[in-house]
């Protein structure tokens, strides 16, 4: 097919010879609304931001990638000729760095369903260079770890030696999805969840007098666990009053989230406060209702065979504790009116 109508994008991959690195190309159709094919999805053209990775059809795997040989030979199907390059949906993954990856890569929809689709293609001219200057000794790694449950950050390797003030506007992607609000060379993650694990791509534009190109780096982010620094968090009950019917049985559930600890001795118990007295209630055993790498949610119920007038004067207190500290949540019973 004729590639002269394809939009063109120039990219630069500067790889470190010291570390293993990956690289990605998105089938990045810059103005989807110009092509009939490029917005055949659930979003209306007005809702598709420019420079989104290819979102052309409901099935993103129906994209074909080619490489254009430098000697002018016909386009080659990537999947057949390049074992170190993997196509995942609309993204092309380069598993190993090297100048031999330099070249022109073309993507377009597999299914041409209308005459307009012919021009729905992108040509990416990729230049790959080894990093030469060691001017930035502490540049960010292409593999970065985030400690689950804490605040962390993800730095763009190609810009990590620049201050935020000097840094150009950066475009970030996570697992191929544009993170439109992240624009600096460092993403601050307020609280790290396992969701934050993935492949991040940072792009910025570099120009000279002749042309401009996109400098791209890929960061593999892994989320790791450290011992919690937080006391447990009571998820339920949230309200401090509970409407009840006198004479009826009642179960009050206490659910608490305990952060990961290598030596884990969670405490979850109910006690009752009545004027100056307080006593622990023997209630059914606590049970774990959800366990993840980062935390565990434990539930313990208090069961009243029937609610009495006396219970309305009492406070039912859920007490939870780990090695960091404790949290309580009290519940006052209130008679249901009407």
């Amino acid at each position: 097919f004729n590639i002269s109508g394809c939009s063109t994008k120039k990219l630069l991959w500067t790889y470190s010879t010291r570390s293993e690195e990956e690289f990605v190309l998105f089938c990045d159709l810059p103005e989807p609304q110009k092509s009939h094919f490029c917005h055949r999805n659930r979003l209306s053209p007005k809702q598709v931001p420019e420079h989104l990775p290819f979102m052309g059809s409901n099935d993103l795997s129906d994209v074909q990638w080619y490489q254009q040989p430098s000697n002018g030979d016909p386009l080659e199907d990537i999947r057949k000729s390049y074992p170190h390059i993997i196509q995942d949906k609309c993204t092309l993954h380069f598993l190993t760095p090297g100048v031999n990856n330099s070249g022109s890569y073309i993507c377009r929809p597999k299914m041409i369903k209308s005459p307009y689709d012919v021009a729905c293609c992108v040509k990416m001219i990729l230049e790959v260079k080894p990093q030469t200057n060691a001017s930035c000794e502490y540049s960010a790694s292409h593999k970065q770890d985030l400690l689950l449950g804490s605040t962390g950050s993800i730095s763009c390797p190609s810009l990590s030696c620049q201050s935020d003030a000097q840094s150009p506007a950066v475009t970030w992607y996570k697992n191929g999805k544009l993170l439109s609000v992240e624009r600096s060379n460092r993403i601050v993650v307020d609280e790290v969840y396992d969701y934050h694990q993935g492949t991040y791509v940072c792009d910025y534009t570099q120009s000279d007098t002749v042309s401009s190109w996109t400098v791209r780096a890929v960061v593999q982010v892994r989320t790791i666990v450290g011992d919690t620094k937080l006391k447990p968090d009571i998820l339920d009950p949230v309200e401090d009053t509970l409407e009840v019917e006198l004479g009826k049985p009642l179960t009050i559930s206490c659910k608490a989230r305990f952060g990961f600890e290598r030596v884990f001795n969670p405490v979850i118990k109910w006690y009752i406060k009545d004027s100056d007295l307080e006593w622990e209630v023997s209630v059914p055993e606590a049970k774990s209702i959800k366990s993840t790498l980062k935390d565990e949610i434990i539930e313990r119920n208090i069961i009243l065979e029937k609610v009495t007038q006396r219970d309305l004067r009492r406070k039912f207190v859920c007490f939870v504790q780990n090695s960091i500290g404790n949290t309580t949540q009290s519940v006052q019973l209130k008679e249901k009116r009407g």
């Epitope: 804490s150 993170l179 439109s180 609000v181 307020d190 609280e191 998820l235 989230r257």
Partner: antibody
Framework: SLEESGGVLVKPGASLTLTCTAS?????????ICWVRQAPGKGLEWIAC????????TYYASWAKGRFTISKTSSTTVTLQMTSLTAADTATYFC?????????????WGPGTLVTVSS | DVVMTQTPASVSEPVGGTVSINCQAS??????LAWYQQKPGQPPKLLIY???NLASGVSSRFKGSGSGTEYTLTISDLECDDAATYYC?????????????FGGGTEVVVK
């Protein structure tokens, strides 16, 4: 509980600082504290949030950037500074705190404080 | 900012009926969505978080569903007390889970 204060009648062009005070709780690290406003008879409009943890990250609605500033001034107070006020800023201003493991939702709200901008 | 489009603006149903309120996000918000109920003169009350999780103390007549860009709040067996304005709210901002943009609201009238 949460309580907003500082809502008064001001003239267009004036500045105003609203305060959100927590009692019985503190703005501990796992929470976002946010300001939301509601013009008379209109819908809820998100203004800004601050993360109470170590990052102290702040987040603003695009229309609020530059004119509104959210700050955590102590473990129990968060403020919203507003400048160049216009009649369009007349609203009840609520502060809200995130909940449990779903920090991106707010289950604890103040009753609101009314700001009136009029000459 | 994400744009949250809520429909319908108003709906009227008899007691015992069912109401569905839709919320469309301008981009994939990955189920970081909450629903609130607000009555005149009161702050909003959280009903649903994470698109489908019922907040503590909320009646199971309220059901949240959806993913990606399309979300729905369904209220079944309508009661007079359900008359209120309902709002959806997006809860993701870049890589952080931050309460942010609201939908325009839906007024539910119970006949």
């Amino acid at each position: 509980s949460l309580e907003e204060s500082g809502g008064v009648l001001v003239k267009p062009g004036a500045s105003l600082t609203l305060t959100c005070t927590a009692s019985g709780i503190d703005f501990s690290s796992s929470y976002y504290i946010c300001w939301v406003r509601q013009a008379p008879g209109k819908g809820l409009e998100w203004i800004a949030c601050i993360y109470a943890g170590s990052s102290g990250s702040t987040y603003y609605a695009s229309w609020a950037k530059g004119r509104f500033t959210i700050s955590k001034t102590s473990s129990t107070t968060v403020t919203l500074q507003m400048t160049s006020l216009t009649a369009a800023d007349t609203a009840t201003y609520f502060c809200a705190r995130g909940t449990g493991s779903s920090h991106y939702t707010s289950n604890l709200w103040g009753p609101g404080t009314l700001v009136t901008v009029s000459s | 900012d994400v744009v949250m489009t809520q429909t319908p603006a108003s709906v009227s149903e008899p007691v015992g009926g069912t109401v569905s309120i839709n919320c469309q996000a301008s981009e994939d918000i990955e189920s970081y969505l909450a629903w609130y109920q607000q009555k005149p003169g009161q702050p909003p009350k959280l009903l649903i978080y994470g698109a489908s999780n019922l907040a503590s103390g909320v009646s199971s007549r309220f059901k949240g569903s959806g993913s990606g860009t399309e979300y729905t709040l369904t209220i079944s067996d309508l009661e007079c007390d359900d008359a209120a304005t309902y709002y959806c709210q997006c809860g993701i901002y870049g890589v952080n889970f931050v309460p942010n943009v609201f939908g325009g609201g839906t007024e539910v009238v119970v006949k």
